[in-house]
Interface confidence: low
């Protein structure tokens, strides 16, 4: 097992992107090609990530850090560090288990990625939609017909919905 | 990744602004989420931004909470007011609206007197 | 408000079972699928397991599933294995931006 580290263990003076090489009387030997130590005192370096097929390089390996990656157009990050590669899908659309489809009329998605949302419904804040909603956009709600008069605002960003369970028509 | 700030100590009543900074990816492009964990408690769902930077609430953070971004800073802000004691808890930022892949260290806010 | 109820609240099995834990909502969830499965270690910050009901997240071992449509969901582990003591929680997601986390089963080894 590794040894208590001290004043005493050779390895600690080992900084980083090198390792405490056993076969070398624990002489301090550089990370070979493609691989890193991050910290010092290390017993082995590991071996860099590889950002291969959808996956490109965003920070190149060096021998004391790891490669970072994200990925090719068309597709997007998820997970830490990039972990994953998702399909982008265009702005109104939705990725489903069949590839991308149209939101369904009375939803949206602003992003190429995600799901398609309900518009929100203006009616729960007493207000009435002043833009209509599409396929990328959610609706627009205005104030109350009761609030049209002179010099009242005309535009308000889209209300949060109000109660849980209601679904924005 | 996502680094919380900003939590501590504060006296029922108070107020207090946690802060999320995103490296690695634009917050801008993601919808993203505060989570709570009182200590030894279960997570509880505070609210979401979208990326048009319209803000939802669970309806026990409604009205005292307010969830904003920063999108110069890449960064992601949980406002608080009127703090009581059993807002004491862990407060993590995640990111994702269909399922949060990314979350946060965690920023604990004690509120006692 | 919707209620998330998770079952069993805690549970005990030995390594190799398979274990089963269950969601009920009291609503159905939005598009009958918008339900996530999380783990959290001790002191650990949650992990996304499961999104859509049964998409495994990327790096997940595949002894982990989910299933279930509308209000009814399950995740199981085939074959229960050391590393997988924790709590999980399930989370629903609803029209108007709503989500809810489930109570949480905590899983321990015999």
């Known amino acids: 097992f590794e040894r208590t580290r001290s004043l005493q263990d050779p390895c600690s003076n080992c900084p980083a992107g090198t390792f405490c090489d056993n076969n070398r009387n624990q002489i301090c030997s550089p990370c070979p090609p493609n691989s890193f130590s991050s910290a010092g005192g290390q017993r082995t370096c590991d071996i860099c990530r590889q950002c291969k097929g959808v996956f490109r390089t965003r920070k190149e390996c060096s021998s004391t850090s790891n490669a970072e990656c994200d990925c090719t157009p068309g597709f997007h990050c998820l997970g830490a560090g990039c972990s994953m590669c998702e399909q982008d899908c265009k702005q109104g659309q939705e990725l489903t288990k069949k590839g991308c489809k149209d939101c369904c009329f009375g939803t949206f998605n602003d992003q190429k990625r995600g799901i398609c949302r309900p518009w929100t419904n203006c009616s729960l804040d007493g207000k009435s939609v002043l833009v209509n909603g599409t396929k990328e956009r959610d609706v627009v709600c205005g104030p109350s017909p009761a609030d049209l008069s002179p010099g009242a605002s005309s535009v308000t960003p889209p209300a949060p919905a109000r109660e849980p369970g209601h679904s924005p028509q | 990744s996502l680094v919380e700030s900003g939590g501590g100590l504060v006296q029922p009543g108070g107020s207090l602004r946690l802060s999320c900074a995103a490296s690695?990816?634009?917050?801008?492009?993601?919808?993203m989420n505060w989570v709570r964990q009182a200590p030894g408690k279960g997570l509880e769902y505070i609210g979401i931004?979208?990326?048009?930077?319209?803000?939802y609430y669970a309806s026990s953070a409604k009205g005292r909470f307010t969830i904003s971004r920063d999108n110069s800073k890449n960064t992601l802000y949980l406002q608080m007011n009127s703090l009581r004691a059993e807002d004491t808890a862990v407060y993590y930022c995640?990111?994702?609206?269909?399922?949060?892949?990314?979350w946060g260290q965690g920023t604990l806010v004690t509120v006692s007197s | 408000d919707i209620q998330m109820t998770q079952s069993p609240s805690s549970l005990s099995a030995s390594v190799g079972d398979r274990v089963t834990i269950t969601c009920q909502s009291s609503?159905?969830?939005?598009?009958?699928?918008?339900l996530s499965w999380y783990q959290q270690k001790p002191g650990k910050v949650p992990k996304l397991l499961i999104y859509?009901?049964?998409t495994l997240a990327f790096g997940v071992p595949s002894r982990f599933s989910g299933s279930g449509s509308g209000t009814d969901f399950t995740l199981t582990i085939s074959s229960l294995q050391p590393e997988d003591v924790a709590t999980y929680y399930c989370?629903?997601?609803?029209?108007?931006?709503?989500?809810?986390f489930g109570g949480g089963t905590k899983v321990e080894i015999k």
């Open positions: 989370q629903g997601g609803y029209s108007g931006w709503i989500y809810v």
């Open positions: 859509y009901a049964s």
């Open positions: 690695g990816f634009s917050l801008s492009n993601y919808y």
């Open positions: 995640a990111r994702g609206d269909y399922g949060m892949d990314l």
């Open positions: 609503q159905t969830v939005y598009n009958n699928n918008l």
């Open positions: 931004i979208s990326s048009s930077g319209s803000a």
